[in-house]
């Protein structure tokens, strides 16, 4: 099953997976000035059998200028905020990770791909965190998060990582010897109180009805 929400955000840190469980989807996103080909794949899907897993579908991008029915609008400055998704990086898969049965490796890049990859993960997926450049990792426990199913809802475990503003970066697993870290607080696996809040889409009616979910502003 797909995880309903996204992996936790850790200040000054990014996450990535070493391998992707079957069922994982990768959005076919294109860089600015390009778009998916008409009726092209919306996402790649990690599929497979007991012996081999691979990515189904191919992402293809074409110049936005070739489709005159597409209205392309330059976003406002506030819309150019950096996306908090996994940054696309060169594949660095330890063989024992990417060769796991039922897992796919990092897909190769496609032409005119967006600079960041957006994955939709499935239950059981593990992602690893590292501090961004210029920040140092203080571990209270594992710097990883797992999507789990609890009481019919999906949730991500909380990575025990703090990134402090010192010029030393931590590494993803397999890149260098793991740092020793003090024991982290174990998460409860039984209490329903630990489940994450359901995601919401809601708004308020401007100054009139607090219970309405959409703000309507008359011009």
């Amino acid at each position: 099953e797909l995880c309903d929400d996204d992996p936790p955000e850790i200040p000054h840190a990014t996450f990535k997976a070493m391998a992707y469980k079957e069922g994982t989807m990768l959005n076919c996103e294109c860089k600015r000035g390009f778009r998916r080909i008409k009726s092209g794949s919306l996402y790649m899907l990690c599929t497979g059998n007991s012996s081999h897993s691979s990515w189904d579908n191919q992402c293809q991008c074409t110049s936005s200028a070739t489709r005159n029915t597409t209205k392309q609008v330059t976003p406002q400055p506030e819309e150019q905020k950096e996306r908090k998704t996994t940054e696309m990086q060169s594949p660095m898969q330890p063989v024992d990770q990417a060769s796991l049965p039922g897992h796919c490796r990092e897909p190769p890049p496609w032409e005119n791909e967006a600079t960041e990859r957006i994955y939709h993960f499935v239950v059981g997926q593990m992602v690893y965190y590292q501090c961004v450049q210029g920040y140092r990792a203080l571990h209270r426990g594992p710097a990883e998060s797992v999507c789990k199913m609890t009481h019919g809802k999906t949730r991500w475990t909380q990575p025990q990582l703090i990134c402090t503003g010192e010029m030393e970066t931590s590494q993803f697993p397999g890149e260098e010897k793991p740092q020793a870290s003090p024991e982290g607080r174990p998460e409860s696996e039984t209490s329903c109180l630990v489940t994450t809040t359901d995601f919401q889409i809601q708004t308020e009616m401007a100054a009139t009805m607090e219970t309405s979910i959409f703000t309507t502003e008359y011009q």
């Epitope: 929400d5 778009r35 008409k38 919306l42 996402y43 936005s64 392309q72 976003p75 996306r83 359901d198």
Partner: antibody
């Protein structure tokens, strides 16, 4: 008819800036109709033909908000308008919706 | 095109809803939603056959190409609602809906 209205949708609980977002409407007693969608960074916007040139979709990722500016409103625009997150090729979750009535 | 427009059944019965596309639905980009009066649609099935999180296993989706079905194996009282299919080609499109009502 002919008036303007701006709808706002505030999202929480997911990484808003990582998803395409859509507006879907439903006329009273009728089925669902997709209206418009917008890419994560706002650089691509698409509309159903019937609202092209009159409606504008936009977003503010800093505020986790999605907007629909509706101009030159017509009676046939009367509907419940839902905002929804696009995930893969489907919509989930959906907002609760707001009724827009265009009448003289 | 969704058929039938209305399905009159009793609790415990099996419901089979049909969705037929005018063109082949690429990559099984087809979803099913349930909508109850005064509520927003709720995702049931995505990718033609995958159940969304928290959806009971009495709901199942099937099909490929142009013909898709949603099956409710044993209707529960809370299942009586309107069901929509939705495809994603160059843009999203919804079927006209099937109302499942109590006989």
């Amino acid at each position: 008819p002919g008036g303007s209205l701006r709808l706002s949708c505030a999202a929480s609980g997911f990484t808003f800036s990582s998803y395409w977002m859509s507006w879907v409407r439903q006329a009273p007693g009728k089925g669902l109709e997709w209206v418009a969608n917008i890419k994560q960074d706002g650089s691509e916007k698409y509309y159903v033909d019937s609202v092209g040139g009159r409606f504008t979709i936009s977003r503010d990722n800093a505020k986790n908000s999605l907007y629909l500016q509706m101009n030159s409103l017509r009676a046939e625009d009367t509907a419940v308008y839902y905002c929804a997150r696009e995930k893969g090729s489907w919509f989930d979750p959906w907002g609760q919706g707001t009724l827009v009535t265009v009448s003289s | 095109t969704q058929s039938p427009g209305t399905l009159s059944l009793s609790p415990g019965e099996r419901a089979t809803l049909s969705c037929r596309a005018s063109q082949s639905v690429s990559n099984n980009y087809l979803a099913w939603y349930q909508q109850k009066p005064g509520q927003a649609p709720r995702l049931l099935i995505y990718g033609a056959s995958s159940r969304a999180t928290g959806i009971p296993d009495r709901f199942s989706g099937n099909g490929s190409g142009t013909d898709f079905t949603l099956t409710i194996s044993r209707l529960e009282p809370e299942d009586f609602a309107v069901y929509y299919c939705q495809r994603y080609g160059s843009s999203p499109r919804f079927g006209g809906g099937t109302k499942v009502e109590i006989k």
